[in-house]
């Protein structure tokens, strides 16, 4: 089976490596822009140079291509906490990352958000604090684990999931609660 | 079929409260971050509220910060966003979506909206 290709794909691939094939003359293959640059005027005819610039400020193309214009630098989101890990380059978009002590939680391949990393207060560090992925928190006896966070078992309430790990507390109190009762 | 179908817009006064329900059906809502998205009167888009699939991430822009709090009942297939101390520039027609899994689009799926109007 033949993987599907584009019309884009189809026309690169008659070219060898590095080249493309003329859009208006399909017997010429022109030499692609190397990264930072972008197509300006293709090659006026076979072992001849194609016309390459240099991407404009704020502007990028991270690989060879054939492309007419540059691509827009990304901006980082600020309302999503993100910071600029290292600023856009003719050759290499901008960079966005979260502070220290915080991770990333993807709401979609193309958006994160940072979050402050759990310290785990009444408990332990299971598994550290990744960059994609909170701490993992184990928490001590008398504590359960609610969002995230070592939550004291006196706020289990007998619906909820705590009870297996509050079981002898919600007891304690039962039968505190039932000696006093006369 | 996917759907979203938003209730709970109406018109109230300025430092009122209303609370938005969407009912989804059509997919495996436990599985999906939802979002509220707003279109002011001759205005653009805006992200309101997001929330991931268990309710651990929220998302809140600025300007409903304090005020709105969005939540999720995963057994009921049911998104909500709680308005409070509402404001005349809350006023919008507001949208439930779904987060796409796609890199070409944010959210792949829209409720028709329901209309919240702020106003004395």
């Known amino acids: 089976l033949v993987p599907h290709l584009g019309d884009r794909e189809k026309r690169d691939s008659v070219c060898p490596q590095g080249k493309y094939i003329h859009p208006q003359n399909n017997s010429i293959c022109c030499t692609k822009c190397h990264k930072g640059t972008y197509l300006y005027n293709d090659c006026p005819g076979p072992g001849q140079d194609t016309d390459c610039r240099e991407c404009e400020s704020g502007s990028f193309t991270a690989s060879e291509n054939h492309l007419r214009h540059c691509l827009s630098c990304s901006k980082c989101r600020k309302e999503m906490g993100q910071v600029e890990i290292s600023s856009c380059t003719v050759d290499r978009d901008t960079v966005c990352g979260c502070r220290k002590n915080q991770y990333r939680h993807y709401w979609s391949e193309n958006l994160f958000q940072c979050f402050n990393c759990s310290l785990c207060l009444n408990g332990t560090v299971h598994l550290s604090c990744q960059e994609k992925q909170n701490t993992v928190c184990t928490c001590h006896a008398g504590f359960f684990l609610r969002e995230n966070e070592c939550v004291s078992c006196s706020n289990c309430k007998k619906s909820l999931e705590c009870t297996k790990l509050c079981l002898p507390q919600i007891e304690n109190v039962k039968g505190t609660e039932d000696s006093g009762t006369t | 079929e996917v759907q979203l179908l938003e209730s709970g817009g109406g018109l109230v006064q300025p430092g009122g409260s209303l609370r938005l329900s969407c009912a989804a059906s059509g997919f495996t809502f436990s599985m999906y971050s939802m979002a509220w998205v707003r279109q002011a009167p001759g205005k653009g888009l805006e992200w309101v509220s997001f929330i991931d699939f268990d309710g651990l991430h929220t998302y809140y822009a600025d300007s409903v910060k304090g005020r709105f709090t969005i939540s999720r009942d995963n057994s009921k297939n049911t998104l909500y966003l709680q308005m409070n101390s509402l404001r005349a520039e809350d006023t919008a027609v507001y949208y439930c979506?779904?987060?796409?899994?796609?890199?070409?689009?944010?959210?792949?799926?829209w409720g028709q909206g329901t209309l919240v109007t702020v106003s004395s």
């Open positions: 979506a779904k987060f796409s899994t796609s890199t070409m689009a944010l959210f792949d799926y």
